[in-house]
Amino acid sequence: LLDTRQFLIYNEDHKRCVDAVSPSAVQTAACNQDAESQKFRWVSESQIMSVAFKLCLGVPSKTDWVAITLYACDSKSEFQKWECKNDTLLGIKGEDLFFNYGNRQEKNIMLYKGSGLWSRWKIYGTTDNLCSRGYEAMYTLLGNANGATCAFPFKFENKWYADCTSAGRSDGWLWCGTTTDYDTDKLFGYCPLKFEGSESLWNKDPLTSVSYQINSKSALTWHQARKSCQQQNAELLSITEIHEQTYLTGLTSSLTSGLWIGLNSLSFNSGWQWSDRSPFRYLNWLPGSPSAEPGKSCVSLNPGKNAKWENLECVQKLGYICKKGNTTLNSFVIPSESDVPTHCPSQWWPYAGHCYKIHRDEKKIQRDALTTCRKEGGDLTSIHTIEELDFIISQLGYEPNDELWIGLNDIKIQMYFEWSDGTPVTFTKWLRGEPSHENNRQEDCVVMKGKDGYWADRGCEWPLGYICKMKSRSQGPEIVEVEKGCRKGWKKHHFYCYMIGHTLSTFAEANQTCNNENAYLTTIEDRYEQAFLTSFVGLRPEKYFWTGLSDIQTKGTFQWTIEEEVRFTHWNSDMPGRKPGCVAMRTGIAGGLWDVLKCDEKAKFVCKHWAEGVTHPPKPTT
C-alpha cells in the first residue's frame, strides 16, 4: 500500500509510470500501485528517493541527454537536486534541463532540454505535480542531535532505513539517524510519532489533564519548534492561568536555558498572541520585557529566572515546550446568532442573544462607564469571538478614531485580565505592541481603538467613550424584519444585501443558486465587509461558506466570479499554497479566514447583490 508520502511518477502522454528496474536502469512501465519499483518519495526539499532501492534519482552531470539513474542519497550533491518548474515540469535545480521520457531508442528516463509533453509528469491518480506531495522535515526528540531533523534514508549497522525504526531496541521506540550515516556520525533522535511508551515523553498535569513536553536538549528556531509540536498534534505552550505557570515553573526548575513558548507578535497588525489561539490574558514578563527592539517577536520562558518570559529574535536556537490535551476554553459556548431571538431596546443593537450600545459622546473614566452600563441593565462589553468583535466594528457604528472602554481589566489580580461581567476570557485581540502594561503607570483597563478595533491596556482614569452590552430579553418567536432595500431573508450591510445559502452545494452549484436569485457568490472588498461577513456566518456550526473567489479560470490567479478586481485578501495560514481550487470562509476558531478547497466539495454559501434604491458609486480608476 502507498503511504501518504509515496507516489508514482506518471506521464500522461504515454500513460505510463517511472519504474526503477535496477539502480542503473530507471525506465517506464504500465502503472501499478503495488509495484515497489514504481514508488518514490521526497526525502529532502530537493531529493527524490526510490522506495524499492532506498537510493535517490540523480544524474552523472548537468548536461543534455544523460541518463537519470539511482545514486546513494547525498544531500550535498548538486546532481540529485530536483525542483518543480512551471506546471508539471521537473528539472534539475538551477538548470533548464528536465526529467524526460526518453524515446524509442532510449528506454531510460533522460535529462533533456525539451519541455514538451514528454517532460511533463504528475502524481499518478491526481492532477497534481510532484511537488504537491513535498517533503516535510521531521524534528527528533531526545537523542543526541539537539532535535535535528531525520535524514532519510540513513544507514544503521550497514542497513539502510527510509523510515523511523525500532532497530537495536526491544521496547518499540521509533528513532532515526539525523545524518545519512549513523554508523559513522552516531547522531540520532526519537521520532515524534505514536508508539508504545511515547506517552512518557509528556508530563500530565493531574489537575487539568493537560500534557506538556519539555524539549530542553533541542536547539531549534521558534518556527521549527512550533512545527515539531504540531507534528505531535500539539502546539507550542500557551499559559492562560496562574496555576499553569506554577506547574511549569516546577517542571522546569532544574533547567537553566531558555525554552520557546507559543507567545509571539508575528502578526503584522496585531499585538502579543499565543500560537494556539488561546487568549493572551495572563502576563509573566521578565522585568524589562517585552523589549521594543524590532525583530524580537518570539518569546522564551526562562527557567533560571523563575520561568518568566522574555522576547527574543525568532531565529535563535533554543529548547521548547509543547502542550496538548483539553483546554479549559471550550466549556464556554457562545450561542450562534441564528439560535437566539434577540430583542433590544431602542438605540441598542442585537447580536447573538445580546444587545450593544456605543456611548461615544459622554466620556467617562472606566469605573464610571462600568457604573453607567450596569445602571442600564448591562456591563461594559465582553468580547468572546472574532465574530463578536467584527459585529461591533461593522454594525455598531464604530469609527476608526474611536477609543472606547471595554470590560477587560486586571484590577483584581495584577497581570491577569478578566471581564467585568464575569464571563471567561476566551479571546483577545491586542493592538501591535500591546498589552504594554507600562511600569511607570498602572495600565489596568482596556480600550478598543484604531481602524480594526484591536485592544490596548490603558490607565483606568482616562475619560473615554465606552461600549455597553446586556442580555437581550426574548419575547416569543422572532419577527423577521425586512431590511430596507433587501428582500425577506436577506441581510443589509452598507450598499448590499446578503443571504446565506442553506443547501450544501459545490462551488458551481452555489454560484448557479446565487445567479438564480439575481445575485452572485459574495465578493469581499475590504476589511469592513470581511468583518460583517465574519459576524454573519462565523458562529454557525457549518465549517465552510463559499465565496465567489477561485482560480478555476487561470491556475494560480484567483478571481471573483463577477468582473471585480481582487483588492483585499484574508487567507488562513498556509493559504493559498500551491493547490488550485475555490475559496471558502472558515467558521469557528479561524472565523472568517479564507481556505482553498476542492471546488466539488459541498458547503453552504453567501450570495450578494446591490440593495434596491442604492446609487452605484463609480468604479475606481486605476
Partner: nanobody, 119 residues
C-alpha cells in the same frame, strides 16, 4: 553511557532468602523496563522476572510465588526478593534495563552477581 551495578548475591542455604538490587546510572531519560535473568553453568541465560515503568510484572513459572520483583523509579533501581530458595536457583543473576538514552540501543546489562544455594 548507561551502567548497571548488581549487588546482594552470595551463599545461602536451601529454604533461605536473598535480596538482589540493581542500580542504573548514566545519561538516562527514562527506563521502560527492568528485569532479572540468570545463567546456570552450562545452560542458556533465562528470564526470571521483569517489571515495566508502569509497574506490570512478569515471572518465569519456576519462580512464581517465591520471587518478587519491585522497583524504585526515583532511584532507578530494581530489586529481586528471593524466598524459599532451592539448589536449582544457583546461577549468575544478571540485571537488564531497557532504557531511553543517548544512543538508539535500548538494552543494557550488568556484570552479574553469583547466587549459590547449597547446604
Amino acid at each position: 553511557d548507561v551502567q548497571l551495578v548488581e549487588s546482594g548475591g552470595g551463599l545461602v542455604q536451601p529454604g533461605g532468602s536473598l535480596r538482589l538490587s540493581c542500580a542504573a546510572s548514566g545519561s538516562i531519560f527514562t527506563i521502560n523496563a527492568m528485569g532479572w535473568y540468570r545463567q546456570a553453568p552450562g545452560k542458556q541465560r533465562e528470564e526470571v522476572a521483569a517489571i515495566t515503568s508502569g509497574g506490570s510484572t512478569n515471572y518465569a513459572d519456576s519462580v512464581k510465588g517465591r520471587f518478587t520483583i519491585s522497583r524504585d523509579n526515583a532511584k532507578n533501581t530494581v530489586y529481586l526478593q528471593m524466598n524459599s530458595l532451592k539448589p536449582e536457583d544457583t546461577a549468575v543473576y544478571y540485571c537488564k534495563a531497557v532504557v531511553v538514552t543517548t544512543t538508539p540501543y535500548s538494552d543494557y546489562w550488568g556484570q552479574g552477581t553469583l547466587v549459590t544455594v547449597s547446604s
